[in-house]
C-alpha cells in the first residue's frame, strides 16, 4: 500500500541548557497536529518508511522585534538535520533570523527508516509555542 | 478516485475598510492560477473534500522597503485560517513582516468539506498583485 | 504509471558576468540531491512530464549580514521562471532579500514537457553553496 506517511507537529518545549533541540508533540487531542506513520521519540521525529520526503518548518521567535534579532552578534539560527543514527548525521536545512522573527522553509530529501530528525535552535531567543506560528512536518512523497 | 484536489490562486483585490481579508481569483484565463476541486466563494477558498492538505502562501507588499515595514508600531501581519463554518474557526498559519517585504510559508493541516479559508492582512501596507509575488494555494495530500 | 517526477538540486556555481542564472547540479554522488525524471541541461532544470508541479527554492547569501543586504540601492532579488521555450517564458516566483540573508518559498504551477526553469539572482551578493542553505526542487503532484 502507498506509504503516505505524514506528520505535522507543534512545539512542546525547548531543551535544557546546552541542548539546542526543540521538542515536539503531535496528536489530535492537541489540536491540528498529527502523526500518521512516523514516530515521536522523546520529542524528536523518527521516520518509519524509506523514501523521499518533503520536510517543512516554520519557527517564530517569542517576544521578538527586528531589533532583538539584529542586536545579537551571533544570529539566532535554526537547523533541521538527521541526528541519529550517527552514521547518517547531516544538516538538511538551515536558516538564520536576520532582523526577522520568523523563518519558514521546506525541502525534498531522502530519508530512511530509523532516521531521527532534530531541529536545533541556537541563540538566546525562545520560540513561540503558538500552533500557527511554530510547526514542523514531513510528508512522504515517493519511494 | 483519488482526490488530488488542488488550487493555486492569485490576488484579485483587498477588502473594503475594516475587512482585512484578501480576495483571490483563479483560472487559466487569468494566467497560471487554477481551481481543481476547491471552489472560490466571494474570493475566499472553500474546500470540497475532507483530508490533509498542504496549504502554502506568499504575500509581497507593494511599494515596500525595509524601512516601510519597520516604521510601523504594529507590524503588518498575515494570517491564514478557517473562517467558516464559525464552529471550526481557527488560525492555521501566521507571519509578520519584520523589516521584510515578503512572507512565505506552508503547512500540513486537516481540512473538511465546507471549510472556507481566509487570508487576513492587517496593517496599512498593501499587497502586490503581481502573480509571481503574491499567491495562495492548497494541495490535498491524503485522506 | 504515476509520474512522480521529482528533483532536488544543489548549487553548482553562478553564471559569468551578465548572466544572472544560478547553475545547479544533482545526483546521489553529490550528497542529498537527485533527479528522478527531470533533466539538467547546462545547469538548468528541464521538465520531462506535463503536469502541475510544486516548485520550491531556498537561497542563502554568502558573507551576508542584515547591513549588507540593506546597503544596496537595488535589493538583491531571486526570480524563478520558465526561460525556454521563449514562447512560454514567464516569471513564476520572485522574492527580494530585504535586510535578510535567506529567501525561501514554494508554489504550485503547471509545467509542460520541455519547459526549462531558470533561477535568476540579481545583485552583487553571491549565494552560499552549502547544501543545507541553498537548494531548488520540483515535485510533480498531478496531471
Amino acid at each position: 500500500s502507498l506509504g503516505w506517511d505524514i506528520a505535522e507537529l507543534q512545539l512542546n518545549h525547548t531543551g535544557p541548557q546546552q541542548d539546542p533541540r526543540l521538542y515536539w508533540q503531535g496528536g489530535p487531542a492537541l489540536g491540528r497536529s498529527f502523526l500518521r506513520g512516523p514516530e515521536l521519540d522523546k520529542g524528536q521525529l523518527r521516520i518509519r518508511r524509506d523514501g523521499i520526503y518533503m520536510v517543512h518548518i516554520q519557527v517564530t521567535l517569542a517576544i521578538c522585534s527586528s531589533t532583538s534579532t539584529s542586536r545579537h552578534h551571533h544570529p539566532t539560527t535554526l537547523a533541521v538535520g538527521i541526528c541519529s543514527p550517527a552514521s547518517r548525521s547531516i544538516s538538511l536545512l538551515r536558516l538564520s533570523f536576520h532582523q526577522g522573527c520568523t523563518i519558514a522553509s521546506q525541502r525534498l530529501t531522502p530519508l530512511a527508516r530509523g532516521d531521527t530528525l532534530c531541529t536545533n535552535l541556537t541563540g538566546t531567543l525562545l520560540p513561540s509555542r503558538n500552533t500557527d506560528e511554530t510547526f514542523f512536518g514531513v510528508q512522504w512523497v515517493r519511494p | 478516485s483519488l482526490g488530488w484536489d488542488i488550487a493555486e490562486l492569485q490576488l484579485n483585490h483587498t477588502g473594503p475598510q475594516q475587512d482585512p481579508r484578501l480576495y483571490w481569483q483563479g483560472g487559466p484565463a487569468l494566467g497560471r492560477s487554477f481551481l481543481r476541486g476547491p471552489e472560490l466563494d466571494k474570493g475566499q477558498l472553500r474546500i470540497r473534500r475532507d483530508g490533509i492538505y498542504m496549504v502554502h502562501i506568499q504575500v509581497t507588499l507593494a511599494i515596500c522597503s525595509s524601512t516601510s515595514t519597520s516604521r510601523h508600531h504594529h507590524p503588518t501581519t498575515l494570517a491564514v485560517g478557517i473562517c467558516s463554518p464559525a464552529s471550526r474557526s481557527i488560525s492555521l498559519l501566521r507571519l509578520s513582516f519584520h523589516q521584510g517585504c515578503t512572507i512565505a510559508s506552508q503547512r500540513l493541516t486537516p481540512l473538511a468539506r465546507g471549510d472556507t479559508l481566509c487570508t487576513n492582512l492587517t496593517g496599512t501596507l498593501l499587497p502586490s498583485r503581481n502573480t509571481d509575488e503574491t499567491f495562495f494555494g492548497v494541495q490535498w495530500v491524503r485522506p | 504509471s504515476l509520474g512522480w517526477d521529482i528533483a532536488e538540486l544543489q548549487l553548482n556555481h553562478t553564471g559569468p558576468q551578465q548572466d544572472p542564472r544560478l547553475y545547479w547540479q544533482g545526483g546521489p554522488a553529490l550528497g542529498r540531491s537527485f533527479l528522478r525524471g527531470p533533466e539538467l541541461d547546462k545547469g538548468q532544470l528541464r521538465i520531462r512530464r506535463d503536469g502541475i508541479y510544486m516548485v520550491h527554492i531556498q537561497v542563502t547569501l554568502a558573507i551576508c549580514s542584515s547591513t549588507s543586504t540593506s546597503r544596496h540601492h537595488h535589493p538583491t532579488t531571486l526570480a524563478v521562471g520558465i526561460c525556454s521555450p521563449a514562447s512560454r517564458s514567464i516569471s513564476l516566483l520572485r522574492l527580494s532579500f530585504h535586510q535578510g540573508c535567506t529567501i525561501a518559498s514554494q508554489r504550485l504551477t503547471p509545467l509542460a514537457r520541455g519547459d526549462t526553469l531558470c533561477t535568476n539572482l540579481t545583485g552583487t551578493l553571491l549565494p552560499s553553496r552549502n547544501t543545507d542553505e541553498t537548494f531548488f526542487g520540483v515535485q510533480w503532484v498531478r496531471p
Epitope: S1, Q25, G26, G27, F34, L35, R36, G37, P38, E39, L40, D41, R46, R48, D50, R113, G114 | - | -
Partner: antibody, heavy 115, light 112 residues
Framework: ELQVVESGGGLVQPGGSLRLSCAAS????????MHWVRQAPRKGLEWVST????????YYADSVKGRFTISRDHAKNTLILQMNSLKSEDTAVYYC????????WGQGTQVTVSS | QTVVTQEPSLSVSPGGTVTLTCGLS?????????PGWFQQTPGQAPRTLIY???SRHSGVPSRFSGSISGNKAALTITGAQPEDEADYYC???????????FGGGTHLTVLG
C-alpha cells in the same frame, strides 16, 4: 521510568474472549507503533499484531486475523488486544512492545485457553 | 508460506566468536527486511539487541553486532561471555507490508 505493563491474561474456555491491556508509563503511547508478540509454552516468538501511530493501519498474523483486534485507549495511554473465539493454540505469554524497532518489551501476561 | 530459518543450536567458548544467521526459506534477506535480533534468557522477557540490520539498541554491549552476510542476516558475538548463553531470535519485516516473521530461535551455549 519508561515501562510497558501487560494485564488481562488468565484462564478462558475455547470460544471465549479476553481483553489484554498494555499500560504505558514514562511515554505517550500514541507517539509509537505498538506490537503484540506471543510465545507458546516451550516455543519460539510469534508476531501477533501491529498498530500505527494514528491507528489507521492495523496488521495481524494470519493465525489471528478476524478474531483479534488491536486498538488504543488514548485517555488511559493503553494498548488493547481484544481476543475473541479463542482456541487452545492461542495459549501463550503475550508481550506488548513499543516502537517500530521493538525497542521496549513488557514482562508479558499469560493466556491459557483450556476446557 | 515463507519461513524464517535459524540454526537450532550453536556453541562457543568463552572469549570466542560466534555468528548466528537468519535466512528466508525462499529468497534473500536484505536491509529492507530490517532484521532485528532479540535475546531471551530463561524466565525473562526478550530484549532487543539489534534493529534495522546493524543498529545496536541502547545498553547493548559492543560485542554484539549485526550485518547482512551473503543472503542472510547475521548476529556476531565477538568475545562471548557466560551471560550470553540464551535463546536468540531474529525477526524480519515483510517488505512493504509492516508484517513480521520471527525465526524459530537459536539456543546458544557458552561452553565451560
Amino acid at each position: 521510568e519508561l515501562q510497558v505493563v501487560e494485564s488481562g491474561g488468565g484462564l478462558v474456555q475455547p470460544g471465549g474472549s479476553l481483553r489484554l491491556s498494555c499500560a504505558a508509563s514514562g511515554f505517550t503511547l500514541s507517539n509509537y507503533w505498538m506490537h503484540w508478540v506471543r510465545q507458546a509454552p516451550r516455543k519460539g516468538l510469534e508476531w501477533v499484531s501491529t498498530i500505527s501511530t494514528d491507528n489507521s493501519r492495523t496488521y495481524y498474523a494470519d493465525s489471528v486475523k478476524g478474531r483479534f483486534t488491536i486498538s488504543r485507549d488514548h485517555a488511559k495511554n493503553t494498548l488493547i488486544l481484544q481476543m475473541n473465539s479463542l482456541k487452545s493454540e492461542d495459549t501463550a505469554v503475550y508481550y506488548c512492545i513499543r516502537g517500530s524497532d521493538y525497542e521496549h518489551w513488557g514482562q508479558g501476561t499469560q493466556v491459557t485457553v483450556s476446557s | 508460506q515463507t519461513v524464517v530459518t535459524q540454526e537450532p543450536s550453536l556453541s562457543v567458548s568463552p572469549g570466542g566468536t560466534v555468528t548466528l544467521t537468519c535466512g528466508l526459506s525462499s529468497g534473500s534477506v536484505t536491509t529492507t527486511n530490517y532484521p532485528g535480533w532479540f535475546q531471551q534468557t530463561p524466565g525473562q522477557a526478550p530484549r532487543t539487541l539489534i534493529y534495522s540490520t546493524s543498529s545496536r539498541h541502547s545498553g547493548v554491549p559492543s560485542r554484539f553486532s549485526g550485518s547482512i552476510s551473503g543472503n542472510k542476516a547475521a548476529l556476531t558475538i565477538t568475545g562471548a561471555q557466560p551471560e550470553d548463553e540464551a535463546d536468540y531470535y531474529c525477526a524480519l519485516e515483510e517488505i512493504g507490508s509492516y508484517t513480521y516473521m520471527f525465526g524459530g530461535g537459536t539456543h546458544l551455549t557458552v561452553l565451560g
